[in-house]
């Protein structure tokens, strides 16, 4: 794809996107702002103790389509939302944890006394 005044486009996006980052800030971020050629994201997931943890940041163009597709992972409650419409758009993303399924309460084989 050709960009205005350029021989070849460096990426699918003509310009860098700035995102809020929290718990997921790369070394090149400044003041909790990262930059990307892909997407901003906000994700909620349970940690090992079952506490919901929210992280946000930047996803590079490579592989971001897959990462932004909220495919369920067995035995892991998490949800991710992505955006590109403006800088720091992920400030306004509020993903929620998927509801618990009955089997999520089961931690292994059930033993009866």
């Amino acid at each position: 794809k050709k960009e205005d005044g350029e021989s070849t486009a460096p990426t699918a996006r003509p310009k860098v996107l700035r995102c809020k980052c929290h718990h997921h800030c790369p070394e090149d971020s400044v003041n909790n702002i990262c930059s990307t050629d892909g997407y901003c994201f906000t994700m909620i997931e349970e940690d090992d103790s079952g506490t919901p943890v929210v992280t946000s940041g930047c996803l590079g163009l490579e592989g971001s389509d897959f990462q932004c597709r909220d495919t369920p992972i067995p035995h892991q409650r998490r949800s991710i939302e992505c955006c590109t419409e403006r800088n720091e758009c992920n400030k306004d993303l509020h993903p929620t944890l998927p509801p618990l399924k009955d089997r999520d309460f089961v931690d292994g084989p059930i033993h009866h006394k």
Partner: antibody
Framework: QVQLQQPGAELVKPGASVKLSCKAS????????MQWVKQRPGQGLEWIGE????????LYNQKFKDKATLTVDTSSSTAYMQLSSLTSEDSAVYYC?????????WGQGTTLTVSS | DAVMTQSPLSLPVSLGDQASISCRSS???????????LHWYLQKPGQSPKLLIY???NRFSGVPDRFSGSGSGTDFTLKISRVEAEDLGVYFC?????????FGSGTKLEIK
């Protein structure tokens, strides 16, 4: 073709403010950031900051945070930089430049002279 | 801030010679996306800078193939295979990986 038009020169008094302009043409104004760069003779190039015309989001070099204010008028595809409390240290050539992931086009620059 | 150190400051050459300019960064310019945002510009007297090379080694449209860029991490090089009169001026490297974006101090290419 991509063009960034800047006035050739501005003369202002110490302590005053000035608003430099940069009129863009030949591309979709909101598709690229606009950066501003300072060049003083023998002192190289300094990045002042940038603005995304699509949402007016700004990013500044901390060194210029209290000196420069970046704005845009999307209806006329024009970027502005206001410089305040001017001193002789602000005398320089100021360039606007189109930025995607790198600067590919520069304006011709405005020579700012601060003198009483 | 990423400090960009260029060498030499002045490079006297004869027309037709090869010229090589070095640019070193105080920190790696590999961005978290995997891209390396190191670029080269030429500024002729009384003019604004013009883009030659973007992202280390990509020639910008209209730039002759005698210009080439190479390097990785913190060390980068601009080579001009056969210097022509129109190549004379000041060459700057620039990084847009880390905010604030920074420039090298410039290398003046002049006739020997």
């Amino acid at each position: 073709q991509v063009q960034l038009q800047q006035p050739g020169a501005e003369l202002v008094k110490p302590g005053a403010s000035v608003k430099l302009s940069c009129k863009a043409s030949g591309y979709t104004f909101t598709n690229y950031w606009m950066q501003w760069v300072k060049q003083r003779p023998g002192q190289g190039l300094e990045w002042i900051g940038e603005i995304d015309p699509s949402d007016r989001y700004t990013l500044y070099n901390q060194k210029f945070k209290d000196k420069a204010t970046l704005t845009v008028d999307t209806s006329s595809s024009t970027a502005y930089m206001q410089l305040s409390s001017l001193t002789s240290e602000d005398s320089a050539v100021y360039y606007c430049a189109r930025f995607g992931y790198y600067v590919d086009y520069w304006g011709q620059g405005t020579t700012l002279t601060v003198s009483s | 801030d990423a400090v960009m150190t260029q060498s030499p400051l002045s490079l006297p050459v004869s027309l037709g010679d090869q010229a090589s300019i070095s640019c070193r960064s105080s920190q790696s310019l590999v961005h978290s996306t995997g891209n390396t945002y190191l670029h080269w510009y030429l500024q002729k007297p009384g003019q604004s800078p013009k883009l030659l090379i973007y992202k280390v080694s990509n020639r910008f449209s209209g730039v002759p193939d005698r210009f080439s860029g190479s390097g990785s991490g913190t060390d980068f090089t601009l080579k001009i295979s056969r210097v022509e009169a129109e190549d004379l001026g000041v060459y700057f490297c620039s990084q847009t990986t880390h905010v604030p974006f920074t420039f090298g101090s410039g290398t003046k290419l002049e006739i020997k």
